[in-house]
């Protein structure tokens, strides 16, 4: 019989129940569970009564969810806790609005933040719920500041891997990259090594994805097939006779692309993608050591 049925029988047929079976002593309310609660909690907890715990949304119960009211009127509770399975938004600074607004976010979900009227955002605008259930980049880095007078307010200067959207800089989509220098990179999460480009690595970093440069022999880069004139890379130019792309001289670089750190003949130096591509195109062995300018030169 269920507890409710027994109670009902007790009322209808009290002679069937010896007095010793009528509970006169009860356990107190079951102990609280951090980030969780007792399902269908009643008000009376006689000896032998079981209760089942469950976790709040965004949390998963680890351990035995059942607790029992013991003979000594104490709860017999096994080892259990609620483990976070999602990112939750921290308390955001005044004026910051998040989109989409949800109680929790699963790994891989993205949140964008913006400022309410009259304020402008300082710091990153997009955050990713990482596999460690932490936001990347950290949300505390975003804050709202008073906008300058609209007459003097300049259009924000976006980085090359960003674009202007709703008067603020947001990460580009990878397909918006255009021609860029091929590199090999390791996905920090899966540890797989993949062919990328300098621009796509910047975009992935911008969107909170972690990739690290690896040697160019560690993956299969796209073959530098002879391209028709309409699709020359930054470091290529059109040869009128053959209607094919040929290598530029580094000194001929026009639209330069990103500034990157390259090791040439054992020495690190900052150069443009175009210059690096021109050297590689002409058969020189170069190694991209950073998708940003070399550290020593930026200090």
């Amino acid at each position: 019989c269920e507890d409710e049925e027994l109670e009902h029988l007790r009322l209808l047929e009290p002679h069937c129940f010896p007095l010793s079976l009528v509970p006169t002593e009860f356990c107190p309310s079951p102990p609280a569970l951090k980030d969780g609660f007792v399902q269908d909690e009643g008000t009376m907890f006689p000896v032998g009564k079981n209760v089942v715990y469950t976790c709040n949304e965004g949390y998963s119960l680890i351990g035995n969810p059942v607790a029992r009211c013991g003979e000594d009127l104490r709860w017999l509770v096994g080892e259990m806790h609620c483990q976070k399975i999602a990112c939750v938004l921290p308390v955001l600074m005044d004026g910051i609005q998040s989109h989409p607004q949800k109680p929790f976010y699963t790994v891989g979900e993205k949140v964008t933040v913006s400022c309410s009227g009259g304020m402008s955002l300082e710091g990153p605008s997009a955050f990713l719920c990482g596999s460690s259930l932490k936001w990347s980049p950290e949300m505390k880095n975003a804050r709202c500041v008073q906008k300058e007078n609209p007459l003097t307010q300049a259009v924000p200067k976006c980085q090359r891997w960003e674009k202007l959207q709703n008067s603020r800089c947001v990460c580009k989509m990878p397909y918006e990259c255009g021609p860029s220098l091929d590199v090999c990179a390791q996905d920090e999460r899966s540890k797989r090594i993949l062919p990328l480009t300098v621009c796509k690595m910047h975009v992935l970093h911008c969107q909170g994805r972690n990739y690290t440069l690896t040697g160019r022999d560690s993956c299969t880069l796209p073959a530098s097939a002879e391209k028709a004139c309409g699709a020359c890379p930054l470091w290529g130019k059109c040869d009128a006779e053959s209607s094919k792309c040929v290598c530029r001289e580094a000194s001929e670089c026009e639209e330069e692309g990103f500034s990157i750190c390259v090791e040439v003949n054992g020495k690190e130096q900052t150069m443009s993608e175009c210059e690096a591509g021109a050297l590689r195109c002409r058969g020189q062995s170069i190694s991209v050591t950073s998708i940003r300018p070399c550290a020593a030169e930026t200090q």
């Epitope: 674009k163 709703n166 990878p174 990259c177």
Partner: antibody, heavy 115, light 107 residues
Framework: EVQLQQSGPELVKPGASVKMSCKAS????????MHWVKQSHGKSLEWIGY????????SYNQNFKGKATLTVNKSSSTAYMELRSLTSEDSAVYYC????????WGQGTTLTVSS | DIQMTQSPASLSASVGETVTITCRAS??????LAWYQQKQGKSPQLLVY???TLADGVPSRFSGSGSGTQYSLKINSLQPEDFGSYYC?????????FGAGTKLELK
């Protein structure tokens, strides 16, 4: 609310050109790329290219280079696609769609190429 | 160019059932994948982007998953309004390409 209003159906002869329009409203026109997509009758979707309304820079699918030309008029928040040297293969519904993935789609312009 | 291979081409199911549509990319697209729904005579509508994020207003019975080159769209407890065609599309590099589509029909 984002809305993309496309021009009406077109019936044209082989060899001719056609220019269809897509008027955007409900958002800042320069904020989002405008993509164009072809859907032949009963078939899947084929990406033609996109244009960045900020700088007017287009990016084309190689299969449509020489066939399609994408332009924008920022003052009227309108994107245009011109298709030239038309053949019966070009008969299809053409969609404009704005956003990153893209997110929002117009109702489509039906192009029929027939003699 | 990255090719998208979508399966099945067609699918019959009843209201209340759960269905899964899959999409395979010919190269790693790093989760830059979208799913669209298209009803007869209408424009496609964005359902999912970044492989698993639901677009605004999309019911929670839809869910996207996958990584690398393999992705899927799952629809739990099919509703009458869910029948139509579904397309996957990557936005990792140009040209953006779509899968051939899956026609979901009422059994």
């Amino acid at each position: 609310e984002v809305q993309l209003q496309q021009s009406g159906p077109e019936l044209v002869k082989p060899g001719a050109s056609v220019k269809m329009s897509c008027k955007a409203s409900g958002y800042t026109f320069t904020d989002y790329n405008m993509h164009w997509v072809k859907q032949s009758h009963g078939k899947s979707l084929e990406w033609i290219g996109y244009i960045n309304p900020n700088n007017g820079g287009p990016s084309y699918n190689q299969n449509f280079k020489g066939k399609a030309t994408l332009t924008v008029n920022k003052s009227s928040s309108t994107a245009y696609m011109e298709l030239r040297s038309l053949t019966s293969e070009d008969s299809a519904v053409y969609y404009c769609a704005c956003g990153n993935y893209p997110d929002y789609w117009g109702q489509g312009t039906t192009l029929t190429v027939s003699s | 160019d990255i090719q998208m291979t979508q399966s099945p081409a067609s699918l019959s199911a009843s209201v209340g059932e759960t269905v899964t549509i899959t999409c395979r990319a010919s190269g790693n697209i790093h989760n830059y994948l979208a799913w669209y729904q298209q009803k007869q005579g209408k424009s496609p509508q964005l359902l999912v982007y970044n492989a698993k994020t639901l677009a605004d207003g999309v019911p929670s019975r839809f869910s996207g998953s996958g990584s690398g080159t393999q992705y899927s769209l799952k629809i739990n407890s099919l509703q009458p309004e869910d029948f139509g065609s579904y397309y996957c599309q990557h936005f990792w590099s140009t040209p953006l390409t779509f899968g051939a589509g899956t026609k979901l029909e009422l059994k």
